[in-house]
């Protein structure tokens, strides 16, 4: 992800006195809270692989750029960043890698300027449905996200909740349509199954998709015409047997879009004539030398590019009668 | 309710180790957090460490960091909580709990083990 990394400023190291001792009280403006790395003139703080149980209550308001990664945080409560002053400035969060497992309503309110937020492995079992959001209102307050990073945030198949993993994830991206301005989205190696039809409608902004090393088998319900900013769509290392002429049209009407379809099972049977035609004449795959079939036997490893209609036949479907046990 | 049991208490000299178990008659899937407390004779019950189910997520007490391990088996539905380096003053009940919250807490934890006692001699 694009995340903010600090300048080369001089960072500063809090003693973990000097928190505890003044954490009920606004912090100085040059504070740096216990376990953390602070640059006012990198606006950033660093609280890295510290074990941090709870975001620190004594930010300094002039933060920017916020690295909370490899902690154990477990829980993001509602107004988790709330703070008197706000933290105004505050535009990229890292949360990464810090054993959450749940996310509240509203945990993300009172941060007007936060613009990249990253919260990739993570197992958040329970990502509520306002976690972006904040509110249950039909129609929230736009979120100021542009950037929302979601790879690797699906629990151990043992540790999930007994409910549709996607639906969860989908759900807290659509509530209230508050990331109608987001531009990249990332959800790669999530385990999905299946993209809900209606998410890709409600996000109009987006420029950046990343559904790479999933387990998506199709694509046929799934529209990308709203999406005509669409640059970037990342589909390398699902389970993508063969796109239809409806997503190859969709796909071949977005004016800027580059799509990456590396390492998919492609069946090559007479299903595939239409993906091959299309490819031989797109611009817009990159990589397509590299596409090759996995099934049927007799066809693994072939090029896509270089097959032809003859190659692409489906065996007879028998009648009853005549199919042997 | 979950039923929750304690077990692997005695007596340790100081400097030794012990583990305690705490085995969960189900998976307390209302309970996201399991956690050992511990109390002596005529004092509030004490925060020692927690665990997440999902995630694994830890925190511990100031007093006992870097000396005991809390951790968690999803498939035995068993938490755990290794201690080294025992001192006397960690003489004490302990007590195996489950709750919602992330908390350190008493009232974070809505369900109670009996305890197991542990007797660090000098």
């Known amino acids: 992800s694009s995340s903010p990394t600090s300048s080369a400023s001089s960072f500063s190291s809090s003693a973990p006195f000097l928190a505890s001792a003044v954490s009920a009280q606004p912090p100085l403006p040059d504070q740096c809270p216990a376990l953390c790395e602070c640059s006012e003139a990198a606006r950033t703080v660093k609280c890295v692989n510290r074990n941090l149980t709870e975001v620190p209550t004594d930010l300094p308001a002039y933060v920017r750029n916020l690295f909370l990664t490899g902690n154990q945080l477990a829980v993001l409560p509602a107004g988790a960043f709330a703070r008197r002053p706000p933290l105004a400035e505050l535009a990229a969060l890292n949360l990464s890698g810090s054993r959450l497992d749940e996310v509240r309503a509203g945990a993300f309110e009172h941060l007007p300027s936060l613009r990249q937020l990253d919260l990739s492995h993570n197992p958040l079992a329970d990502l509520s449905p306002f976690a972006f959001s904040g509110s249950n209102a039909s129609v929230s307050a736009p979120s100021p996200l542009v950037e929302l990073i979601l790879n690797h945030i699906v629990p151990p198949e043992d540790e999930r909740q007994n409910r549709s993993f996607e639906g969860m994830v989908v759900a807290a991206l659509l509530a209230g349509r508050a990331l109608q301005g987001l531009r990249r989205l990332e959800l790669a190696s999530n385990h999905f199954l299946y993209l809900p039809r209606d998410v890709l409608a409600q996000l109009p902004s987006l420029r950046h998709l990343d559904l790479s090393n999933n387990s998506l088998v199709s694509l046929t319900y799934v529209s990308f015409r709203n999406l005509t900013h669409l640059e970037s769509l990342h589909l390398e290392d699902n389970a993508l047997k063969v796109l239809h002429n409806g997503t190859l049209a969709e796909l071949q009407g977005l004016p800027h879009i580059r799509v990456f379809l590396d390492n998919n099972p492609w069946v090559c049977d007479c299903h595939m004539a239409d993906m091959v035609t299309w490819l031989k004449e797109t611009e817009v795959v990159q990589g397509k030398d590299r596409l090759t079939c996995a099934y049927p036997e007799k066809m693994r490893n072939r090029v896509l590019l270089e097959l032809n209609s003859a190659d692409l036949d489906c065996d007879p479907i028998l009648p009853p009668s005549l199919q042997t046990s | 309710e979950v039923q929750l049991v304690e077990s692997g208490g005695g007596e340790v000299q100081a400097g030794g180790s012990l583990r305690l178990s705490c085995a969960a008659s189900?998976?307390?899937?209302?309970?996201?957090?399991m956690a050992w407390f511990r109390q002596t004779p005529g004092k509030e019950r004490e925060f020692v460490a927690a665990?997440?189910?999902?995630?694994?997520?830890?925190r511990y007490a100031e007093s006992v960091k870097g000396r005991f391990t809390i951790s968690r088996d999803n498939a035995k539905n068993t938490v755990y909580l290794q201690m080294s380096s025992l001192r006397a003053e960690d003489t004490a009940v302990y007590y195996c709990?489950?709750?919602?919250?992330?908390?350190?807490?008493?009232?974070?934890?809505?369900?109670w083990g009996q305890g197991t006692l542990v007797t660090v001699k000098p």
């Open positions: 709990a489950a709750g919602q919250a992330w908390g350190t807490k008493f009232t974070d934890y809505s369900d």
């Open positions: 189900r998976r307390p899937f209302s309970s996201k957090t």
């Open positions: 665990v997440r189910w999902i995630g694994g997520a830890t």
